[in-house]
């Protein structure tokens, strides 16, 4: 046969769907591969073609369109499970070819199974919400395309295995979830239970979104700088270790970086030529504020180690803060000036 | 210094309505959540609402869902509490207090007491 | 709702003898517990957020301490102006709850 164009096994549509559920799979070609949409590519007269690898298996084989009830079924670009079997997990292609012009990609389809609480090996979207904002809502995901706007599906909402009724700040308003000044204790997993109605039948779509409460923007503050600080001393004998900790905390902000490092005479310690070792640990509070901590240590310090100037950095996308740690040789009654 | 100082209370009949106001200063009024707070006479002390700085968000206690509204005015500074179909078992003084879910309620009002009898 | 629950309900001590309240939710409220005192006439004021930490202004002799449901207040050595009223309040979940009050009185 022809030359293909193939993009092989697209492992970053790592597509998860629950057991005995309806499923809609769009050929990602015309998604993230190819310039043109299924309808363009219809009408100049390309065909798109499906086949599948089962699971552990390297033979490809077509998919079987001729099931009962039409369980397995194309429309379009999609490809429909109606519903899922557990063994239909595999790898599939969608190829778009005519006589002249090929071009397939795979993909990977798990079908997981659940328990009655909704428990699975599924991974969930997480969505964050700013703690005591005044409302917040999540929207069930991924349902669009399921049934015509016609349908009016029943739409049931979970807190865990706990159907949400009579929630004090939570309230379920048909496909969307209300959170009324969120609070810590609103984190976790929330479960949307869709049921609606195709040729006599009733479908289920089960779909969870892991909400986290984190700290709200008319908290955030650029770095602060808890240690070192003008209290401490760190004060030495040639020989001993010193040990300096930064240790900076960070108010939780969306998509911020989060930087610490210590320069030594204005220099990183890279740059220099003491052996210096930097130990860094990082601790999160129930909002997501971060606290980093770089400690700085000098097995043997010397005399001249501990003339120099070291100086604690912090910077997160509201501003920097920087703080001298106060270093001075035991018995040397002058502590050298930090200048900044 | 924070300040919240309430007003509005009085004597209503059964059924009635009032309005309490809350002027808060000494602090970016904006910033923080609202809530009220009732003690009846010689009881405990029972959270009746909350709003959220923002003023989006709004929380009752279910025994006055439906009866009482809760709002604020940023630009005033000040937080309010409409009360509507009142009944003797809302006689109480009302606390107006800051909010914030690190440190509960910081700053309290004096009150404002409430008395519903014919 | 949480319901939140202070023993003893009246609590006879005498100046500068140590006093100890409790409080227990009926379900978990993690560190989320606040303390405060009320006087007669007054506002409540707030004493101890966080389950242990001190509001600004709080004396030492004031301290908090439990997590999840057990908490518990301890007025080291009692002055005169510490007698009063003492609410626990819960600010984990909504409704945020009170106790129903400790009276600390002269013995």
């Known amino acids: 046969s022809e030359r293909c164009d193939d993009w092989g096994l697209d492992t970053m549509r790592q597509i998860q769907v629950f057991e005995d559920e309806p499923a809609r799979i769009k050929c990602p070609l015309f998604e993230h591969f190819l310039k043109y949409n299924y309808s363009t590519a219809h009408s100049s007269g390309l065909t798109l073609i499906w086949y599948w690898t089962r699971q552990d298996r390297d033979l490809e084989e077509p998919i079987n369109f001729r099931l009962p009830e039409n369980r397995i079924s194309k429309e379009k670009d999609v490809l429909w499970f109606r519903p899922t079997l557990l063994n239909d997990t595999g790898n599939y292609t969608c190829m778009l070819r005519n006589t002249t012009y090929c071009s397939k990609v795979a993909f990977p389809l798990e079908v997981v199974q659940k328990d009655s609480c909704f428990n699975s090996a599924m991974r969930f979207p997480v969505h964050k919400m700013y703690i005591e904002h005044g409302i917040h809502k999540i929207t069930c995901p991924n349902v669009d395309g399921y049934f015509p706007s016609s349908v009016k599906p029943s739409v049931t909402w979970y807190k865990g295995c706990t159907e949400i009724v009579d929630f004090h700040n939570v309230l379920p308003e048909g496909m969307n979830l209300s959170f009324f000044i969120p609070l810590v204790s609103n984190n976790g997993n929330y479960t949307c239970v869709v049921t609606y109605p195709e040729n006599g039948r009733l479908f289920h779509l089960t779909r969870t979104v892991t909400v986290k409460v984190v700290g709200s923007p008319k908290d955030a503050l650029p770095p602060q700088i808890y240690s070192p600080n003008d209290r401490v001393v760190y004060e030495k004998e040639p020989g001993e270790e010193l040990v300096i900790p930064c240790k900076v905390y960070f108010s939780f902000i969306m998509d911020s970086h989060n930087e610490v490092w210590w320069t030594i005479d204005g220099k990183k310690p890279d740059d220099v030529t003491v052996d210096i070792t930097i130990n860094e640990s990082v601790s999160y509070s129930s909002t997501e504020d971060e606290t980093r901590t770089q400690i700085l240590s000098i097995k043997k310090v010397t005399p001249e180690d501990l003339r120099r100037n070291y100086v604690c950095h912090a910077r997160n996308t509201k501003g920097e803060a920087e703080q001298a740690a106060k270093v001075k040789q035991k018995g040397n009654g002058c502590t050298e000036p930090m200048t900044l | 210094e924070v300040q919240l100082l309430e007003s509005g209370g009085g004597l209503v009949q059964p059924g009635g309505s009032l309005r309490l106001s809350c002027a808060a200063s000494?602090?970016?009024?904006?910033?923080?959540?609202m809530t009220w707070v009732r003690q009846a006479p010689g009881k405990g002390l029972e959270w009746v609402s909350a709003?959220?700085?923002?003023?989006?968000?709004?929380l009752y206690a279910d025994s006055v869902k439906g009866r009482f509204t809760i709002s604020r005015d940023n630009s005033k500074n000040t937080l309010y509490l409409q009360m509507n179909s009142l009944r003797a078992e809302d006689t109480a003084v009302y606390y107006c207090?800051?909010?914030?879910?690190?440190?509960?309620?910081?700053?309290w009002g004096q009150g404002t007491l409430v008395t519903v009898s014919s | 709702e949480i319901v939140m629950t202070q023993s003893p309900a009246t609590l006879s001590v005498s100046p500068g003898e140590r006093a100890t309240l409790s409080c227990r939710a009926s379900?978990?409220?993690?560190?989320?517990l606040a303390w405060y005192q009320q006087k007669p006439g007054q506002a409540p004021r707030l004493l101890i957020y966080?389950?242990?930490t001190r509001a600004t202004g709080i004396p030492a002799r004031f301290s908090g301490s439990g997590s999840g449901t057990e908490f518990t207040l301890t007025i080291s050595s009692l002055q005169s102006e510490d007698f009063a009223v003492y609410y626990c309040?819960?600010?984990?979940?909504?409704?945020?709850?009170f106790g129903q009050g400790t009276k600390v009185e002269i013995k």
């Open positions: 207090a800051r909010f914030r879910y690190y440190t509960a309620f910081d700053y």
């Open positions: 000494g602090f970016t009024f904006s910033q923080f959540g």
């Open positions: 709003i959220s700085y923002d003023g989006e968000g709004t």
């Open positions: 379900q978990s409220v993690s560190s989320n």
């Open positions: 966080g389950a242990s």
């Open positions: 309040q819960q600010y984990n979940n909504w409704p945020w709850t």
